[in-house]
């Protein structure tokens, strides 16, 4: 039975040209995290694997940095980066947990962080 919950940074906004940290945290489970995939819509951004470390997809290498922790840092943001991001936790023995973050990249300097929320 899957008992865990994923807490994410929720709906966030950032300025064009700036950077943002995407963070997820898995709690309420003793399951072992085998791998975390970060995806934007259906595109793979990055992988953090327990045995093999970090992998950043080639098309994002220049603008994506691993960490902090299992999170992901997006740099040199453009308006095209606006959209949904998913952290996919592959765990043993529970299975897969998915967290969603919506990022809005703004032209102006009125960007501010949204509240944290939980996805069961």
């Amino acid at each position: 039975m899957m008992t865990g919950t994923i807490e994410t940074t929720g709906n966030i906004s950032a300025e064009k040209g700036g950077s943002i940290i995407l963070q997820c945290h898995l709690s309420s489970t003793t399951a072992q995290v085998t791998q975390v995939n970060w995806e934007q819509q259906d595109q793979l951004l990055a992988i953090c694997n327990a045995d093999l470390g970090w992998h950043i997809s080639p098309s994002f290498k220049d603008r994506v940095a691993p960490g902090p922790g299992l999170g992901l840092t997006l740099q040199s943001l453009t308006v095209n980066d606006t959209g949904e991001y998913f952290c996919i936790y592959h765990t043993y023995p529970d299975g897969t947990y998915t967290g969603r973050i919506f990022l809005e990249v703004l032209e102006s300097s009125v960007a501010e962080h949204g509240a944290r929320f939980q996805i069961p």
Epitope: T34, Q35, I47, H55
Partner: antibody, heavy 120, light 110 residues
Framework: EVQLLESGGGLVQPGGSLRLSCAAS????????MSWVRQAPGKGLEWVSL????????YYADSVKGRFTISRDNSKNTLYLQMNSLRAEDTAIYYC?????????????WGQGTTVTVSS | QSVLTQPPSASGTPGQRVTISCSGS????????VSWYQQLPGTAPKLLIY???QRPSGVPDRFSGSKSGTSASLAISGLQSEDEADYYC???????????FGGGTKLTVL
């Protein structure tokens, strides 16, 4: 269609060297962990070596450690196995295999294999 | 000798259900995923089961995988003559940092 095509097998004398290649197509090669697996005549499957996405982490079976080197060229979508100090017991069909996006799930696609014969 | 232990042979008649076992340890099967491969004579291995009990698309639902403790099983129901092949279990071993294979089970359809 995902395809793996091995080449480079042949007849070599004990103590000799051989370099196997595996050309990959139909998937984003950079995003997947790859392995070599071999099968001696009339025997079972034996894992040989594994390489992560960019080649900075490699693992080997004890039977080939120090003699074989796995590498990859992501710009050419090609996996390699450099085999040195070959022994009669290295005679086998060598398969390259692509792993699932979570490499611990196993190997989902295999090539047809290339035959290596070590004999004087 | 293989790290994972499988019976060398198994058999059944058409339509029967056959189970192949795979025994390992805490560092592989008990705490990791298991996959199963079918190898028809003269061909490359083909994936049947991954993540212990998941079937890739294209694999008939006659094939199923399960796991309990340090053992895993592959079940084939409604046995057919084309199922005659060698079957291998595989798991990543966290201690050895290597893939470990079972010795293989030769399935004969009588």
């Amino acid at each position: 269609e995902v395809q793996l095509l091995e080449s480079g097998g042949g007849l070599v004398q004990p103590g000799g060297s051989l370099r196997l290649s595996c050309a990959a197509s139909g998937f984003t090669f950079d995003d997947y962990v790859m392995s070599w697996v071999r099968q001696a005549p009339g025997k079972g499957l034996e894992w040989v070596s594994l390489i992560n996405w960019n080649g900075d982490k490699t693992y080997y079976a004890d039977s080939v450690k120090g003699r074989f080197t796995i590498s990859r060229d992501n710009s050419k979508n090609t996996l390699y196995l450099q085999m040195n100090s070959l022994r009669a017991e290295d005679t086998a069909i060598y398969y390259c295999a692509k792993h699932w996006i979570v490499f611990q799930y196993g190997m989902d696609v295999w090539g047809q294999g290339t035959t290596v014969t070590v004999s004087s | 000798q293989s790290v994972l232990t499988q019976p060398p042979s198994a058999s059944g008649t058409p339509g029967q259900r056959v189970t192949i076992s795979c025994s390992g340890s805490i560092s592989n099967i008990e705490t990791k995923y298991v996959s199963w491969y079918q190898q028809l004579p003269g061909t490359a291995p083909k994936l049947l089961i991954y993540n212990s009990d998941q079937r890739p698309s294209g694999v008939p639902d006659r094939f199923s995988g399960s796991k309990s403790g340090t053992s895993a099983s592959l079940a084939i129901s409604g046995l057919q003559s084309e199922d005659e092949a060698d079957y291998y279990c595989v798991s990543w071993d966290a201690s050895l940092k290597s893939w470990v294979f079972g010795g293989g089970t030769k399935l004969t359809v009588l």
